[in-house]
Interface confidence: medium
């Protein structure tokens, strides 16, 4: 089942999602929270980590197809590593090819998530809203 | 806790959300699914009902604040009753004041949901994507 179902299917089973922190969004056993308070990238990261989560990591268009719907721009956990020119997630893993369309909006080493799997390069010190994510085991 | 948290709070508890149909979004124990196939309002309603759900009903800005984030336009369960001029949900309940900003985009008796709690009036026969919702008990 895609978030955007192409045909109507009567679900065979109902299931619980989670566990997630209270009042977070749960989708395909990942937890998401959107924070409306604008912070720079570093403070956004700290906010997520203080809640046992990390900034949004995009790892699958299928498992995370709800992200197609998201309007506006929000900090995610993607950062540019100047020494080797790569884009990496907070955990050190490399951005997989074809997952995000990277758009150079500004000079910077951090990236904002925008709908339809786009990443906008931005100066890490600029305040923005942000998305935290917690992967359930 | 709002979906848009204004301050960092370490969640005291982790909890499961649902139950929901498999791979639907769960938020504050409501289930949502976004369908990418364009249908007119009547077919959209039939699609949701076939999955033991209904078209989106907006009943609370607090409990449904994830809807602030939704981009694009999608059929919801709101219909115009010509005899008395009111807007009602599929279940017959009246649209609460101040929940939605109703915008007359077209002449019509159905409404599209758009981000930030806006409802766009549209001809019920026009195909659009749609949002199904299932309230958990």
């Amino acid at each position: 089942n895609s978030l955007f179902n192409q045909e109507v299917q009567i679900p065979l089973t109902e299931s619980y999602c989670g566990p997630c922190p209270k009042n977070w969004i749960c989708y395909k056993n990942n937890c998401y929270q959107f924070f409306n308070e604008s912070k720079n990238w570093y403070e956004s990261q700290a906010s997520c980590m203080s809640q046992n989560a990390s900034l949004l990591k995009v790892y699958s268009k299928e498992d995370q197809d709800l992200l197609k719907l998201v309007k506006s721009y929000h900090w995610m956990g993607l950062v540019h590593i100047p020494t080797n020119g790569s884009w990496q997630w907070e955990d050190g893993s490399i951005l997989s090819p074809n997952l995000l369309t990277i758009i150079e909006m500004q000079k910077g080493d951090c990236a904002l998530y925008a709908s339809s799997f786009k990443g906008y390069i931005e100066n890490c010190s600029i305040p923005n809203t942000y998305i935290c994510m917690q992967r359930t085991v | 806790n709002s979906l848009f948290n204004q301050e960092v709070q370490i969640p005291l508890t982790e909890s499961y959300c649902g139950p929901c149909p498999k791979n639907w979004i769960c938020y504050k124990n409501n289930c949502y699914q976004f369908f990418n196939e364009s249908k007119n309002w009547y077919e959209s309603q039939a699609s949701c009902m076939s999955q033991n759900a209904s078209l989106l009903k907006v009943y609370s800005k607090e409990d449904q604040d994830l809807l602030k984030l939704v981009k694009s336009y999608h059929w919801m369960g709101l219909v115009h009753i010509p005899t008395n001029g009111s807007w009602q949900w599929e279940d017959g309940s009246i649209l609460s004041p101040n929940l939605l900003t109703i915008i007359e985009m077209q002449k019509g008796d159905c409404a599209l949901y758009a981000s930030s709690f806006k409802g766009y009036i549209e001809n019920c026969s026009i195909p659009n994507t749609y949002i199904c919702m299932q309230r958990t008990v």
């Epitope: 990238w41 570093y42 403070e43 990261q45 700290a46 906010s47 980590m49 203080s50 046992n52 990390s54 950062v79 590593i81 790569s86 990496q88 907070e90 955990d91 050190g92 893993s93 490399i94 080493d109 951090c110 890490c124 | 960092v8």
Partner: antibody
């Protein structure tokens, strides 16, 4: 860019001690300061980390169990580790460390010189 | 918590030898793995991050490989200054954990 550690020394079981780490040459508020310890002839053990910015967010290893507390002073660009209810098992070299980039939190390229804490009666 | 298992715990080698140290994670950590070198009485030094990226200033005889759960640190031609203890550390998520270390000694 450097981290200069202070504190440490000999403490009796059940006692407390504070170890601090002063940062210089970089913007302390955009980095995480991490603490790692190493018992004599043993491996490295992560204790926790604190964000240098306004939030002062902290993260601890599960085994810490509230005995240790991280704090930071933005004006002084200093992070501290408060050690309480100490036992002989806490005897170790305590290191502060900083990530290689502000955007990282878990990869450390700058380390303090270490501070020895000995718990003995 | 993610457990990191390093092997061997110690090895003896000669200058010029090719040395391989392995590290296994208890669950998939993608390429979120770092390698450190530590000499007696000194703080650890970062050698490699993101499993295979050489830290600035580290000699090219050091290389890292692997992804998922199995990782390798290789020293292509051991030099006298390379005799030390090497640690792997995952950077996947908190809590962070290190491997038990591999002591490289002179044969």
């Amino acid at each position: 860019q450097q981290l200069e550690q202070s504190g440490g020394g000999l403490v009796t079981p059940g006692g407390s001690l504070k170890v601090c780490c002063k940062a210089s040459g970089f913007d302390f508020t955009t980095y995480w300061m991490t603490w790692v310890r190493q018992a004599p002839e043993k491996g490295l053990e992560w204790i926790g980390c604190i964000h240098g910015g306004d939030s002062g967010a902290t993260y601890y290893a599960n085994w810490v169990n509230g005995r240790f507390t991280l704090s930071r002073d933005i004006d002084q660009s200093t992070g501290c580790l408060q050690l309480n209810s100490l036992t002989a098992a806490d005897t170790a070299m305590y290191y502060c460390a900083r990530p290689g980039y502000p955007s990282w939190s878990k990869t450390f390229d700058l380390w303090g010189q270490g501070t020895m804490v000995t718990v003995s009666s | 918590d993610i457990q990191m298992t390093q092997s061997p715990s110690s090895l003896s080698a000669s200058v010029g030898d090719r040395v391989t140290i392995t590290c296994q994670a208890s669950q998939d950590i993608s390429n979120a793995l770092n390698w450190y070198q530590q000499k007696p009485g000194k703080a650890p030094k970062l050698l490699i991050y993101a499993a295979s990226t050489l830290q600035s200033g580290v000699p090219s005889r050091f290389s890292g490989s692997g992804s998922g759960t199995d990782f390798t640190l290789t020293i292509s031609s051991l030099q006298p200054e390379d005799f030390a203890t090497y640690y792997c550390q995952h950077s996947n998520s908190f809590p962070l954990t290190f491997g038990g270390g591999t002591k490289v000694e002179i044969k």
